[in-house]
């Protein structure tokens, strides 16, 4: 069965949008008007994972690109990257753990916890135009809350 997916954009809780910054990096910045077209559209796939009553496992691919957000150790630190995959094999229901995020909904906001590295979250900086990264703290300076906007396919 084809994996169930939906197209969406994400904005952090300060309303910063996510855009490509080079071929393998995302950054977060405020966009307005026609510039909104720059924001990346994700294909969010609902995959197998350690699902709980308040965590839904998803994979975040870039729509119509063979790139997925993944979590790996770099220099002994959990790191967010965009990873290229074989489009013939992805998306799939049984994604490797590094591609899986636990989508957590709290007060109409979303968090994306790495399945590979529990308590590490997709994060943005308070500052403008900084890379999207994997952060190990919640409720501090860095932003881990997002809203999702559905995009028609």
């Amino acid at each position: 069965a084809p994996v169930r997916s939906l197209n969406c954009t994400l904005r952090d809780s300060q309303q910063k949008s996510l855009v490509m910054s080079g071929p393998y990096e995302l950054k977060a910045l405020h966009l307005q008007g026609q510039d909104m077209e720059q924001q990346v559209v994700f294909s969010m796939s609902f995959v197998q994972g350690e699902e709980s009553n308040d965590k839904i496992p998803v994979a975040l691919g870039l729509k119509e690109k063979n790139l997925y957000l993944s979590c790996v150790l770099k220099d002994d630190k959990p790191t967010l990257q965009l990873e290229s995959v074989d489009p013939k094999n992805y998306p799939k229901k049984k994604m490797e753990k590094r591609f899986v995020f636990n989508k957590i909904e709290i007060n109409n906001k979303l968090e994306f916890e790495s399945a590979q590295f529990p308590n590490w979250y997709i994060s943005t900086s308070q500052a403008e135009n900084m890379p999207v990264f994997l952060g190990g703290t919640k409720g501090g300076q860095d932003i881990t809350d997002f809203t999702m906007q559905f995009v028609s396919s």
Epitope: A1, Q48, E50, S52, N53, K94, V100
Partner: antibody
Framework: EVQLQESGPGLVKPSETLSLTCTVS????????VSWIRQPPGKGLEWIGL???????YYNSPLKSRLTISKDNSKSQVSLKLSSVTAADTAVYYC????????????????WGQGTLVTVSS | DIQMTQSPSSLSASVGDRVTITCQTS??????LNWYQQKPGKAPKLLIS???TLRPGVPSRFSGSGSGTDFTFTISSLQPEDFATYYC?????????FGQGTKLEIK
């Protein structure tokens, strides 16, 4: 060798809380999920819920409001608590280990305890 | 939740017979289907996972096939120790759901 063993009182009064413990060996509770399943006398199997290695839980909807699954990794024990029991909760209760193989077979249950019969009666 | 329809609910057969049990799911689950054997007073034992993968130590007379929504479990030549109840389980998504069971009795 993987082993699971359920224990707890065999008789619980209606409206009270059923409490069971699953003690495991041969694997670590921080690495593998454990499910609870029950089987009323002469009937089929019903999946109750599970606790993952992370401690996150998934409870099956019909029992969700009455169910708590928790664990103590250091004691290799998983506990099940089911509140406000009625005669309909009379069953053999099993715990089982999840296969937990990512991108292959995450949700199957490969090893089971021998089960413990719990009767709800006054 | 995924609904499971297992048939038949009971089956009488003789030693040496070939026996087939079917399991149908309400939605496509690819190959995430398991078969368990349960003897009276005992815990279920996993025989087959991923629709057709025989678990270590399980005799080769047991086999499974199917994908999507339709699955089959076969015992090629019944042995006396095979008389038991068999259950299918979908492991595609939570909550996990079982078939109603098939009781295999001696004719």
């Amino acid at each position: 060798e993987v082993q699971l063993q359920e224990s707890g009182p065999g008789l619980v009064k209606p409206s009270e809380t059923l409490s069971l413990t699953c003690t495991v060996s041969g694997f670590s509770l921080s690495d593998y999920g454990v499910s609870w399943i029950r089987q009323p006398p002469g009937k089929g199997l019903e999946w109750i819920g599970l606790i993952w290695g992370s401690g996150d839980t998934y409870y099956n909807s019909p029992l969700k409001s009455r169910l708590t699954i928790s664990k103590d990794n250091s004691k290799s024990q998983v506990s099940l608590k089911l509140s406000s029991v009625t005669a309909a909760d009379t069953a053999v209760y099993y715990c089982a280990k999840q296969t937990n193989i990512w991108a292959y077979d995450l949700y199957s249950m490969d090893y089971w305890g021998q089960g413990t019969l719990v009767t709800v009666s006054s | 939740d995924i609904q499971m329809t297992q048939s038949p609910s009971s089956l009488s057969a003789s030693v040496g017979d070939r026996v087939t049990i079917t399991c149908q799911t309400s939605t496509d689950i690819d190959d995430d289907l398991n078969w368990y054997q349960q003897k009276p007073g005992k815990a279920p034992k996993l025989l087959i996972s991923l629709a057709s993968t025989l678990r270590p130590g399980v005799p080769s007379r047991f086999s499974g096939s199917g994908s999507g929504t339709d699955f089959t479990f076969t015992i090629s030549s019944l042995q006396p120790e095979d008389f038991a109840t068999y259950y299918c389980l979908q492991s595609d998504r939570l909550p996990l759901t079982f078939g109603q069971g098939t009781k295999l009795e001696i004719k």
